[in-house]
Amino acid sequence: VKMAETCPIFYDVFFAVANGNELLLDLSLTKVNATEPERTAMKKIQDCYVENGLISRVLDGLVMTTISSSKDCMGEAVQNTVEDLKLNTLGR
Amino acid sequence: EICPAVKRDVDLFLTGTPDEYVEQVAQYKALPVVLENARILKNCVDAKMTEEDKENALSVLDKIYTSPLC
């Protein structure tokens, strides 16, 4: 949950790609104004997930979840939260 | 803001060698089945995507990272 909060559109696109849902991917890419060649490129990545099956998608989803919830990322998120709090306090 | 470790993972997925990418994945999930899957996906992407396709995918990532939704 925390990881998706940091950059929701990234996880939207990633899970649309890994899920193999072309319509979902198109919707996500529309949110960032992706061009036609950019969509074509992302669909090629999606093809790889589709071709390699459900297990492959689950395993790669697991990798992304593990990285996103690792100390490398969580430490970063905590640091950002502290910075935000400092700025908000100073702002008052 | 996206976590630098995630950004590095995605960059290597597109522009790194299969060995570089698998090495990066191994830092977080060293299970043989996970690493084999990472190599298969990386090889697939390298086989399908031209250099221009990869640049276009990186361009999408730039748009994502600079989006108000990130």
């Epitope: 090629k44 | 522009t15 086989a47 399908k48 250099e51």
Partner: antibody, heavy 121, light 113 residues
Amino acid sequence: QVQLQQSGPGLVKSSQTLSLTCAISGDSVSSNSVAWNWIRQSPSRGLEWLGRTYYRSKWYNDYAVSVKSRININPDTSKNHFSLQLNSVTPEDTAVYFCARAWNWYYLDYWGQGTLVTVSS
Amino acid sequence: DIVMTQSPDSLAMSLGERATINCKSSQSVLYSSNNKNYLGWYQQKPGQPPKLLIYWASTRESGVPDRISGSGSGTDFTLTISSLQAEDVAVYYCQQYLRNTLTFGGGTKVEIK
């Protein structure tokens, strides 16, 4: 040794469809480390790449913007050939047409003999 | 698209002389991820298709004589024939393959003086 043999009419009427075929020997049209291209050459345009088809678990095509709306490149795995269809031709499409193999999608290492196609008005 | 510009348009040299053909791309064809220049050179004789001579800017295709060599990086490239022979009379083309749309130079005609 890879060989590419082109066939198709040398004369096409304006507004009609130009159709050429490239028969492959010594390689497979569905090889996953090559791409199959069409290029044309005319005095006014020089060498002009038109498009390609390639197989990487599924078929992909790339086309030149200048012809994108009226070109089709189709592989035929049963005959081990690929074809070019260029619709709504005009006299500007008069050229020598070549098929060629690209290593991956890079340099063009094998070429067909070329077919002069004249578009008559 | 990347525009490829060749110079000179034509070249007349004596047998045994050194011939140099230049090719300039409108954008760099050096791909930073692998440090390769996505550039090839072709030779075309009358009534024949182009023949691949050089790829990756400097790698000679098998069967190409070693008097023919390629060099350069980024946007500026050179094809050199160190000692011109009668069989080298042809039109030479450079081509980039970094982009999905392949593009060729306008050609350089090499003749014997």
